[in-house]
């Protein structure tokens, strides 16, 4: 069974996935559809890498764009580099500053729902 | 067949609100976010906004925001767009438009409602 | 916002004629966030071009979408009488989203 073939069984689960199972998918070629990454839960979105987002959506990734202002990816958007956003060529904006370092400061971040960043 | 189809005309005072309707039918309800684009007479396009129906979330364009709440009813594949604190400038004609999750570009309209804001 | 100017603002053309419309951004427009749209008097928008150059679903062949930046162009290659009508740009690529002002092709 393919990758294509794999998501299509799995695909009405997924909603509930957790970020390991994510990122375990993003390596199998699954190609998911924005209309199911939309649905994912922000918190097992937000820490997978954008190579991984790349991996997960495949051909989809340019949907991001339609969708940035949306959750989860508006969450997931704030938390990347913005020179990894850069990387996709989509024109995403909203990412971490270059220069700049994310503190995982774990209550700060449930207090705001953004991460601490220290300017250069 | 993929229809959209909207509520009647309606005729409002200004100050008043006003709430559209637009039921989808013909395809999945949640692979698509509706969008709402106004005309106001003679007038070109002018986006307000969208809802994710699986999802509830929604963006508004600024111009608008505080006065334009979208929301969904998923059991009924009917969108809604209440506008408030009407004025004479928002007489138009108002549109429900599917567009497919990820992409940006409005491949079905609904058949328009005309809103007039009259003393 | 970005601005997109359409121009002309009317073109009267007769049937047969190649149609010329342009839309010009305030600002560069990724080439995938841009699109167009036909409407007839009374009747609501169609969508005519995605993505630039892509036809949609049922639009014959004589439509055709190029561009790139700032400057993108929309051309009929023979008018049909059902081609009289407003047209109209819109753009993607940077919120909110914004048409152009539309250009009305009218039969001379």
């Known amino acids: 069974m393919n990758g294509s073939e794999y998501f299509v069984k799995i695909q009405s689960f997924l909603g509930g996935a957790p970020t390991e199972d994510l990122k375990a998918l993003s390596q199998q070629n699954v190609s998911m559809d924005l209309a199911t990454f939309m649905k994912l839960r922000t918190d097992a979105v937000l820490p997978l890498t954008v190579a991984e987002v790349q991996k997960l959506l495949g051909p989809h990734v340019e949907g991001l764009k339609a969708e940035e202002r949306h959750r989860p990816v508006r969450d997931w958007i704030l938390r990347q580099r913005q020179d990894d956003l850069d990387t996709l060529g989509l024109g995403l904006q909203g990412g971490i500053p270059n220069g700049y370092l994310v503190l995982d400061l774990s209550m700060q971040e449930a207090l705001s729902g953004t991460p601490c960043l220290l300017g250069p | 067949e993929v229809q959209l189809v909207q509520s009647g005309a309606e005729v409002k005072k200004p100050g008043a609100s006003v709430k559209v309707s637009c039921k989808a039918s013909?395809?999945?309800?949640?692979?698509?976010?509706m969008d709402w684009v106004r005309q106001a007479p003679g007038q070109g396009l002018e986006w307000m906004g969208d809802i994710n129906p699986s999802t509830g979330g929604t963006i508004y364009n600024q111009k608008f925001s505080g006065r334009v709440t979208m929301t969904e009813d998923k059991s009924a594949s009917t969108v809604y767009m209440e506008l408030s604190s009407l004025r004479s400038e928002d007489t138009a004609v108002y549109y429900c438009?599917?567009?497919?999750?990820?992409?940006?570009?409005?491949?079905?309209w609904g058949q328009g409602t005309t809103v007039t804001v009259s003393s | 916002e970005i601005v997109l100017t359409q121009s002309p603002a009317t073109l009267s053309l007769s049937p047969g004629e190649r149609a010329t419309l342009s839309c010009s951004a305030s600002?560069?427009?990724?080439?995938?966030?841009l699109s167009w749209y036909q409407q007839k008097p009374g009747q609501s928008p169609r969508l005519l071009i995605y993505r630039t150059s892509n036809l949609a679903s049922g639009i014959p062949a004589r439509f055709s979408g190029s561009g790139s930046g700032t400057d993108y162009t929309l051309t009929i290659s023979s008018l049909e009488p059902e081609d009289f009508a407003v047209y109209y740009c819109?753009?993607?690529?940077?919120?909110?989203?914004?048409f152009g002002g539309g250009t009305k092709v009218e039969i001379k």
């Open positions: 438009a599917r567009r497919r999750i990820g992409t940006g570009y409005f491949d079905v």
């Open positions: 819109h753009q993607w690529s940077s919120f909110p989203y914004t």
């Open positions: 013909g395809y999945t309800f949640t692979d698509y976010n």
């Open positions: 600002s560069s427009v990724i080439s995938s966030y």
